[in-house]
């Protein structure tokens, strides 16, 4: 058993049929010695008396808010949560496996630039009695500071019969140099509590590997005289690291109709303009990627050909 | 503000083209190592990230773009003294810091070159003959060093009398290649920045 936060404790249980469970001793936070009784949750049934209460925790029915009283007055609370371990593996029931970039990916993180700011998000089908708390650091043995905000519900989607909820959190490395060469990864830890179930999820990454620039901005078309060709130009996104001659991007320019199966014109360039062939009912799209370290491409920025 | 983007042209900053070749060569070699050594811990997640130039050179600090010198977090240590002549500086009014930067890059390349050559000598003794260093990568390191053209003491190639542990050597190769790729990215950024300045 360990303390998650004040008056909230996590009991780690091997979860299998007829498992013996864990013996837990609760102590009432009071100078009083006599006349103390214990109850669980909203029940008025007295579980025991005395300053300490010993319980055998085997299942979720044994978890919850234990309260010690004296003469009708509440002295203190202890909330017990369960953390299940099945076949040596901690449970991951609360969050959905996003399976990208690989299986068992519960947390996904992205950074728009090298400033040390990044966003992580996760998915769940649970809508109520759910809380998250996020911590992060650079390295684990001698951790350097990363400050994370509160996790918030950022999107709701309908997937078949199920509703899916996306939560996200923003974090900022306390002293980040955009030009630095990372040797210690960022560690992100998410504590998830659903009712009386506790789970924790972690992710480890270098900022350089989670870079995904914003789409290029200000796309403009200029038809070329006596030609089917069009000059398309754009600018670096505002959120990208500066100076741009140091943090350079490369671009992919594509002309395509509405369907992905349609024919297309595609060209890659390091410049902020390109010449392509425009077709009726097609769109010109441009996306960006770090020129020197191939992490993710940005989303497309698009303008219609006409 | 979009600073001009360079294309490798002989008339331009002479080291840019070489640095682009360097990044390409080390990336290819790293990819080859990952594929060939698939049953060794050779991915970014599996290896320890070591920097053989740590406390010996200060390329990131010495080559910091002017725009980032206002960032406190970027200014850990900037007291280094290197030789200040080099052909990449040709026909330009260059600051002391730029000379310091390029000589730091030169020292990096020299250290990696020695490490890679020593390692290759060991790998050539491996009866499995599983992986060797790409001669193109070694040639590209050499070309960039020549373009930088700094005079510096020769670092003797390390020779080891004990029987090489090929497993450890291959893991060390992965560690070196990952670190060198990151440094090659920095070098490429620096050359692009200097070319645009």
């Amino acid at each position: 058993i360990w303390e998650l936060k004040k008056d909230v404790y996590v009991v780690e249980l091997d979860w299998y049929p007829d498992a013996p469970g864990e013996m837990v001793v609760l102590t009432c936070d009071t100078p009083e010695e006599d006349g103390i009784t214990w109850t669980l949750d909203q029940s008025s049934e007295v579980l025991g008396s005395g300053k300490t209460l010993t319980i055998q925790v085997k299942e979720f029915g044994d978890a919850g808010q234990y309260t010690c009283h004296k003469g009708g007055e509440v002295l203190s609370h202890s909330l017990l949560l369960l953390h299940k371990k099945e076949d040596g593996i901690w449970s991951t029931d609360i969050l959905k496996d996003q399976k990208e970039p690989k299986n068992k990916t519960f947390l996904r993180c992205e950074a728009k630039n090298y400033s040390g700011r990044f966003t992580c998000w996760w998915l769940t089908t649970i809508s109520t009695d759910l809380t998250f708390s996020v911590k992060s650091s650079r390295g684990s043995s001698d951790p350097q500071g990363v400050t994370c905000g509160a996790a918030t519900l950022s999107a709701e989607r309908v997937r078949g019969d199920n509703k899916e909820y996306e939560y996200s959190v923003e974090c900022q490395e306390d002293s980040a140099c955009p030009a630095a060469e990372e040797s210690l990864p960022i560690e992100v830890m998410v504590d998830a509590v659903h009712k009386l179930k506790y789970e924790n999820y972690t992710s480890s990454f270098f900022i350089r590997d989670i870079i995904k620039p914003d789409p290029p901005k200000n796309l403009q078309l200029k038809p070329l005289k006596n030609s089917r060709q069009v000059e398309v130009s754009w600018e670096y996104p505002d959120t990208w690291s500066t100076p741009h001659s140091y943090f350079s991007l490369t671009f992919c320019v594509q002309v395509q109709g509405k369907s992905k199966r349609e024919k297309k014109d595609r060209v890659f360039t390091d410049k902020t303009s390109a010449t392509v062939i425009c077709r009726k009912n097609a769109s010109i799209s441009v996306r960006a990627q770090d020129r020197y370290y191939s992490s993710s491409w940005s989303e497309w920025a698009s303008v219609p050909c006409s | 503000r979009n600073l001009p983007v360079a294309t490798p042209d002989p008339g331009m900053f002479p080291c840019l083209h070489h640095s682009q070749n360097l990044l390409r060569a080390v990336s290819n070699m790293l990819q080859k190592a990952r594929q060939t050594l698939e049953f060794y811990p050779c991915t970014s997640e599996e290896i320890d990230h070591e920097d053989i130039t740590k406390d010996k050179t200060s390329t990131v600090e010495a080559c910091l773009p002017l725009e980032l010198t206002k960032n406190e977090s970027c200014l850990n240590s900037r007291e280094t003294s290197f030789i200040t002549n080099g052909s990449c500086l040709a026909s330009r009014k260059t600051s002391f810091m730029m000379a310091l930067c390029l000589s730091s890059i030169y020292e990096d390349l020299k250290m990696y070159q020695v490490e890679f050559k020593t390692m290759n000598a060991k790998l050539l003794m491996d009866p499995k003959r599983q992986i060797f260093l790409d001669q193109n990568m070694l040639a590209v390191i050499d070309e960039l060093m020549q373009a930088l053209n700094f005079n510096s003491e020769t670092v003797p190639q390390k020779s080891s009398l004990e029987e090489p542990d090929f497993y450890k050597t291959k893991i060390k190769l992965c560690i070196l290649l990952h670190a060198f790729r990151i440094r090659a990215v920095t070098i490429d950024r620096v050359m692009s920045y200097l070319n645009a300045s």
Epitope: R228, E262, K263, K264, R266, V267, F268, D270, I277 | D9
Partner: antibody
């Protein structure tokens, strides 16, 4: 399976014209760009131009501009390349090639040898 | 027009050995570079798209690298069926242009 089948070999006199055909099978004809590339005996490849069969848009290499005409007939899934004012240096194998991507080629025809000789 | 220069023009290789063909562009073409194989009397066959993207059905011994002006096609271990002429082609701008070709011959 996608296939491009070209018309047979031709012998032409200098100053005349030649029209080579390329019939596509497999896949929808208008879903692909169609190019013509030539190869003189023992020489390399030389791009001549492309057509978008969907709308008849064409683009020609400056070297052939004014001398080459590329057309397409959607009803027969056939593209044509006509080269006029032939000279001896136009003796080559003429190949059609196609792709959903405009600027490179994934399927090629077998080639048509055009010999220009007086 | 962008001029593509291949080297060497002829490459004698022992079967089972690796081979590398170089292609250089007269100006920067990013990764807009494609490789083809042509055997005598046959049409070209696509090997690599956009400098390094492998094509389905092409053996994994063929790989491409490069960007900007310098590109390489590598055959990790030459098989008897690989003896042919190889062409690079730029797609950065029209007109599309090819290298002169490199003939890989049995040593």
């Amino acid at each position: 399976q996608v296939q491009l089948v070209q018309s047979g070999a031709e012998v032409k006199k200098p100053g005349s014209s030649v029209k080579v055909s390329c019939k596509a099978s497999g896949g929808t004809f208008s879903d692909y760009y169609l190019h013509w590339v030539r190869q003189a005996p023992g020489q390399g490849l030389e791009w001549m131009g492309w057509i978008d069969p969907e709308n008849g848009d064409t683009e020609y290499a400056p070297k052939f501009q004014g001398r080459v005409t590329i057309t397409a007939d959607e009803s027969t899934s056939t593209a044509y390349m006509e080269l006029s004012s032939l000279r001896s240096e136009d003796t080559a194998v003429y190949m059609c090639a196609r792709n959903k991507e405009l600027r490179y080629f994934d399927v090629w025809g077998q080639g048509t040898l055009v010999t220009v000789s007086s | 027009d962008i001029v593509m220069t291949q080297s060497p023009l002829s490459l004698p290789v022992t079967p089972g050995e690796p081979a590398s063909i170089s292609c250089r562009a007269s100006q920067s073409i990013s990764i807009n570079l494609h490789w083809y194989q042509q055997k005598p009397g046959q049409a070209p066959r696509q090997l690599i798209a956009f400098a390094s993207q492998s094509i389905s059905g092409v053996p994994s011994r063929f790989s491409g690298s490069g960007s900007g002006t310098d590109f390489t096609l590598t055959i990790s271990s030459l098989q008897p069926e690989d003896f042919a002429t190889y062409y690079c082609q730029q797609s950065n701008s029209f007109p599309l242009t090819f290298g002169q070709g490199t003939k890989v011959e049995i040593k």
